[in-house]
Interface confidence: medium
Amino acid sequence: LPAQVAFTPYAPEPGSTCRLREYYDQTAQMCCSKCSPGQHAKVFCTKTSDTVCDSCEDSTYTQLWNWVPECLSCGSRCSSDQVETQACTREQNRICTCRPGWYCALSKQEGCRLCAPLRKCRPGFGVARPGTETSDVVCKPCAPGTFSNTTSSTDICRPHQICNVVAIPGNASMDAVCTSTSPTRSMAPGAVHLPQPVSTRSQHTQPTPEPSTAPSTSFLLPMGPSPPAEGSTGD
């Protein structure tokens, strides 16, 4: 490499390269200084004068050491489905990423060019693979014994609650509806008797211990005669 005492501009030895942060100007045939990030070459070097660098103007940038005559333009403002995660400065371009609930359908070198809303799984379907910054949600039908009653981009299929007595069997889009097995007690007029599930594995309630052998939907019929099902419209 050239001796460190040489000041730019200088002529390199034939076939040689310039030092770090210098470039070979093919017009002047000299090693000249590069401009630092945030600057550009206002005046190119000659055989007798070095590169003159100037700061990038507003809304323009250079991220790398360079000898460009003009700084690069920052990208356009972020769209309504995006958030600005990196502002446009003299040393870096603006970066737009998708806002929550959206994913990047078409990326660019940094950030996202086109955002799309995350798919929502309809009732009877749950999230098989959640959405990421760059991929959409994948839905799957709820397997027997599980359900999803929401239209959501985050909800998974949940196990049906387990009943001592099933009033209405669960399906892919509805939880099982339980009925009470205990004798009806005298109640004040107008009182509502809510069906009591034995246990539930719903995400929305406190889990209670249950035998590991219990099926996800149990049709546990009573051993003897049972009172008429109350609250059979479901809970």
């Epitope: 040689s16 390269t17 942060r21 590069k34 070459a41 250079t62």
Partner: nanobody
């Protein structure tokens, strides 16, 4: 714009050898200068070796006779063969290229070389 990706770094004992490679995502035939520089924690960047498009190599005094730089324009690759490594060679090694069509100095993300017993 050409992207540069370095590989080949790692842990090696003093006196050992490593071969770093720098793969360019596009053609490097129009790139005048390519080279390697290194930076150890708390130190300034040091240009280790460079090679012109004509293939003439140049080396820092500290690595002369131990390191060999080469480039293959057809394979869009730059190499640095490092022999007789010393603990003071420990640093992150960066590949760089002067892209004359764009007017920018491109560089890779770096590969860590650790020389230790």
């Amino acid at each position: 714009e050409v992207d540069l990706v370095e590989s080949g770094g790692g842990l090696v004992q003093p006196g050992g050898s490593l071969r770093l490679s720098c793969a360019a995502s596009g053609s490097i035939s129009g790139i005048y200068a390519m080279g390697w520089y290194r930076q150890a924690p708390g130190n300034q960047r040091e240009l280790v070796a460079a090679i012109s498009s004509g293939g003439k190599p140049n080396y820092a005094d500290s690595v002369k006779g131990r390191f060999t730089i080469s480039r293959d324009n057809a394979k869009n690759t730059l190499w640095l063969q490092m022999n007789s490594l010393k603990p003071e060679d420990t640093a992150v090694y960066y590949c760089y290229a002067d892209d004359y069509s764009a007017g920018f100095e491109l560089r890779g993300q770096g590969t860590l070389v650790t020389v230790s017993s």
